[in-house]
């Protein structure tokens, strides 16, 4: 309604004697700002005076605040929005109705707020979820319809009078919608909390008790059980009787059914709190428990392990591992069902008792071929001795033994012969399936274990074979001792160490890498001419004419081998130099004359120098000296010098004659 002032605040506020009250409040006046505000206690409208009567707790006008008898009331609002109030302390006789008389320039309004002040602090209220189940987390809420900035309080949780360890979350609200203090506690109740008292205690800032609320926990849980057995150790012999009793120590709600389980499986027709087992057999050994159910679910007792004792049953042997590899370790395990466990064992190998072996396991750290055979055992406990079972077979596998390589040929073997070898062995488990040969070659294996080498090489020094099953055993290599003609024959210069210069002393060596047999002869030749029969060929003073292609031959009783042709190069300074002239030694002026420096040198001439008849050097570095155009003044004797890495050589003088042209003669 547009003719009303609009207020928002809690409808009723609660407090107790000596505490305080904080009244959150907002408003919107019809027009303009607030000019006057009076706070009445239990106001009544007087029709005669057209004013409100009642105790004035607080008053303010446009002239300013009128001093109040009581400083305990404070208007914390403003002239247009906020109308928040505080009363501190609050008294029992403040209960009733508070009237907020608001006046603006043209409008008036009375807003009423209820205040409920009790003589003592009122208790908080505990809120529980509708159902609590064991081990399921729940939130307990403690709510107090009070909060005031000037009067701090705290809420504490207790279980059976003892503060609870879990951390509570406290929140307060001081808004125009609600005023409260709330504590929330997250808690996972156990079945043992059923029936216990939970308290929410209101305390002042110093922890002094003010009030509380209590509730009794109703924790739904599955039945909690205890099992008792006679005899108490649950150890009996076959034929004895056993009684088990199931007791319910707690159940909420009441239990509905009872059953018994053995090794997790339900026993049929056993639905009472007592289980009687008469004349038990060994098959009845196992883990027993009782199960009682209610609406929450089934509860199980702890397990009782019933042991029915009996003498060992016929034994079996387990081998880790068969087949076993020679040199590996093997473990034999004697397996026999018995209760109590066997205390003594007797072991047999191929029917013969193994002395000193009385344990459940027999360990052989290094298996040998003779360990193969049948292993069996007998187990014994306090109730008797079992029977010997069928036993287990140990298969010991090993590489082929005593492998040898045998040459079938008559000796000696020559390069190019066909050689046959066989690979022999003594024993093997499993059987030999293949053979290997070293070194590898493109050789024939006409039958298993036989090798045929066609055209045997000079370098086939040794051959070894291996006989293989799962492993290969190698024989010692046998020497073929192949005889062959000398190999890798080559000419080697012994001296000089550097290049050969004309006049040097030169020695050539005929080298070869190997020969079998070792006794050899040498031959030297140059251009088909026999030079000597020693391993060395010597020149006291080499000349350029000794240069050429040299070969040496080495022979033994098998054959002879020649070296590659070796070129003997003799280095010498330029020699036999001469200057040739083109087109000739007589040239007409104005034409072109080319002088060429011809020489014999090794290495070839690298640098030419030209000289005139006065021995003056000309600026040319090439083999040819080109004069174009040639002049009469160029007539004269020329010579050249050739240089290589060995030295220099010079030519004799060659004369160039340049004659006048007909034109020049005509001019004269």
């Amino acid at each position: 309604d547009s003719s009303k002032w609009v207020f928002e605040h809690p409808e009723t506020l609660y407090a107790w004697e000596g505490a305080c009250v904080w009244i959150p409040c907002t408003y919107r006046a019809l027009d303009g700002d607030l000019e006057s505000f009076i706070l009445f206690h239990n106001p009544e409208y007087n029709k005669n005076t057209s004013k409100f009567d009642g105790t004035r707790l607080y008053e303010s006008t446009k002239d300013g605040k009128v001093p109040s008898e009581q400083k305990r009331v404070q208007f914390l609002g403003d002239k247009n929005k906020n109308c928040t109030l505080s009363i501190h302390p609050v008294h029992l006789n403040d209960s009733g109705q508070l009237g907020l008389r608001m006046e603006s320039k043209t409008e008036k309004w009375m807003e009423r707020i209820h205040l409920n002040v009790s003589e003592r602090p009122f208790p908080p209220h505990i809120q529980l979820p509708p159902e609590i189940q064991e081990s399921q987390e729940v939130t307990l809420t403690c709510l107090l319809n009070f909060s005031c900035y000037g009067y701090p309080i705290q809420l504490q949780w207790l279980l059976e009078g003892v503060p609870m360890r879990q951390a509570a979350v406290t929140s307060t609200s001081l808004t125009i919608k609600s005023v409260f203090t709330r504590s929330e506690l997250k808690f996972s109740p156990q079945w043992s909390h059923h029936g216990k008292i939970v308290t929410c205690q209101l305390q002042d800032a110093d922890g002094k008790f003010l009030s509380n609320d209590t509730v009794q926990l109703n924790v739904k849980h599955t039945p909690k059980l205890e099992i008792k057995v006679t005899p108490s150790d649950a150890i009996v012999r076959e034929g004895d009787s056993v009684t088990m009793t199931c007791e319910v120590s707690s159940s909420n709600p009441e239990y509905t059914t009872v059953s018994w389980l053995k090794d997790g499986t339900s026993l049929k027709k056993q639905n009472t709190f007592t289980l009687n087992l008469r004349e038990v057999t060994k098959d009845q050994s196992g883990k027993y428990c009782c199960q009682v159910s209610n609406d929450v679910g089934p509860g199980r007792s702890e397990e009782v392990f019933l042991q029915v004792q009996y003498a060992p049953e016929p034994s079996t042997v387990q081998i880790l591992h068969s087949p076993a590899v020679e040199g590996s370790q093997v473990e034999f395990l004697c397996m026999s069902l018995a209760n109590p466990l066997p205390t003594n064992y007797t072991w047999y190998h191929n029917g013969k008792e193994m002395q000193g072996r009385t344990e459940e396991k027999v360990h052989i750290p290094k298996i040998l071929p003779w360990h193969a055979g049948t292993y069996s055992c007998v187990a014994e406990n306090i109730l008797g001795t079992g029977q010997r079972g069928p036993g287990a077979e140990l298969d010991v596998q090993y590489p082929p033994k005593k492998v040898t390589t045998v040459i079938q040929n008559p000796m000696p073997i020559r390069e190019g012969d066909t050689v046959t070898l066989s690979c022999n062995y003594n024993s093997s488990n499993p059987s030999v399936t293949r053979y290997e040969w070293k070194p590898h070659g493109a050789w024939e294996e006409p039958s298993l274990g036989v090798l045929k080498i066609q055209n045997v090489g000079w370098d086939n020094t040794t051959i070894a074979c291996a006989a293989c099953n799962s492993w290969c055993s190698w024989a010692s290599p046998v020497a073929l001792n192949v005889q062959y003609a000398p190999r890798d024959v080559r000419v080697r210069k012994i001296k000089p160490l550097s290049e050969i210069h004309s006049g040097n002393s030169v020695s050539l060596q005929c080298d070869f890498s190997s020969s079998h047999p070792k006794e050899v002869q040498f031959f030297w030749e140059k251009n088909g001419r026999l030079l000597g029969k020693e391993s060395q060929l010597n020149f006291d003073s080499i000349s350029p004419e000794d240069a050429g292609s040299y070969s040496c031959w080495v022979n033994n009783s098998i054959g002879q081998t020649a070296s590659k042709a070796w070129t003997l190069e003799v280095l010498y300074a330029p020699r036999r130099l001469r200057v040739s002239m083109s087109p000739g030694d007589q040239v007409m002026e104005g034409k072109s004359a080319t002088l060429t420096c011809e020489s014999d040198a090794n290495p070839p001439v690298s640098h030419y120098t030209w000289f005139d008849w006065n021995n003056q050097s000309l600026p040319y570095h090439s083999q040819k000296l080109r004069l174009e155009p040639v002049k009469v003044q160029h007539s004269g004797a020329y010579w050249c010098q050739g240089t290589n890495s060995v030295g220099k050589g010079r030519s004799p003088l060659s004369t160039l004659t340049v004659y006048y042209s007909p034109e020049t003669i005509g001019r004269r």
Epitope: T609, D612, H621, Q633
Partner: antibody
């Protein structure tokens, strides 16, 4: 200090003769360890050796095959200078022309490099 | 007679080293040890920097060095400086009737 000073016209008409002179100071044109060279430079042909003259017991000259037949190098011993004559020029002969010394003796051994250059003459062949 | 082949341009930062190659044939670079190198600044005459493959004329900085392998000669400038920015030409004596041949030239830029 050896210096080479060039002189001669910068503009020559096509088919005419180009004449340039190179005056030597600090050395002799008659030196028997030097040669006296002409080299030209143009954007299209780069650096190009044209020819040389030198004196040993008599005068010798050598020319590049690209200009042989229309080039001659002459010497004036009294003025210690040498000159280049290039006949029947064409616009292709436009470029900067340099005279240069080649000192052929480096101590006792042979050497070969253009160690002293003239300042250069820009020659344009155009009608 | 063909000109000797040089890279058109080479660049480097101050303090760096650069190398310029000069490739010819067995009739010129490969046949004689008469390779020389020239520096030319714009509008100036060439200046001799290296002669006879690896010799330095007096007055030329030892930052300039020359070498030859087979038919290829090289000029190396170490500790590059701003004043080294110029054109560089190689030259060789040749066995042809045109006695000397020059390289195509390399522009060196100092970054």
């Amino acid at each position: 200090e050896v210096q080479l000073q060039q002189s001669g016209p910068g503009l020559v008409k096509p088919s005419q003769t180009l004449s340039l002179t190179c005056a030597i100071s600090g050395d002799s044109v008659l030196s028997n360890s030097d040669t006296w060279n002409w080299i030209r430079q143009s954007p299209s042909r780069g650096l190009e050796w044209l020819g040389r003259t030198y004196h040993r017991s008599t005068w010798y000259d050598d020319y590049a095959s690209s200009v042989r037949g229309r080039v001659s190098i002459n010497v004036d011993t009294s003025k210690n200078q040498y000159s280049l004559q290039l006949n029947a020029v064409t616009p292709e002969d436009t470029g900067v022309y340099y005279c240069a010394r080649d000192r052929l003796q480096d101590g006792n051994s042979w050497s070969d490099a253009f160690d002293v250059w003239g300042q250069g003459t820009m020659v344009t062949v155009s009608s | 007679q063909s000109a000797l082949t040089q890279p058109a341009s080479v660049s480097g930062s101050p303090g760096q080293s650069i190398t310029i190659s000069c490739t010819g044939t067995s009739s010129d670079v490969g046949g004689y040890n008469y390779v020389s190198w020239y520096q030319q600044h714009p509008g100036k005459a060439p200046k001799l920097m290296i002669y006879d493959v690896s010799n330095r004329p007096s007055g030329v900085s030892n930052r300039f060095s020359g070498s030859k392998s087979g038919n290829t000669a090289s000029l190396t400038i170490s500790g590059l400086q701003a004043e080294d920015e110029a054109d560089y030409y190689c030259s060789s004596y040749t066995s042809s009737s045109t006695l000397y041949v020059f390289g195509t030239g390399t522009k060196v830029t100092v970054l």
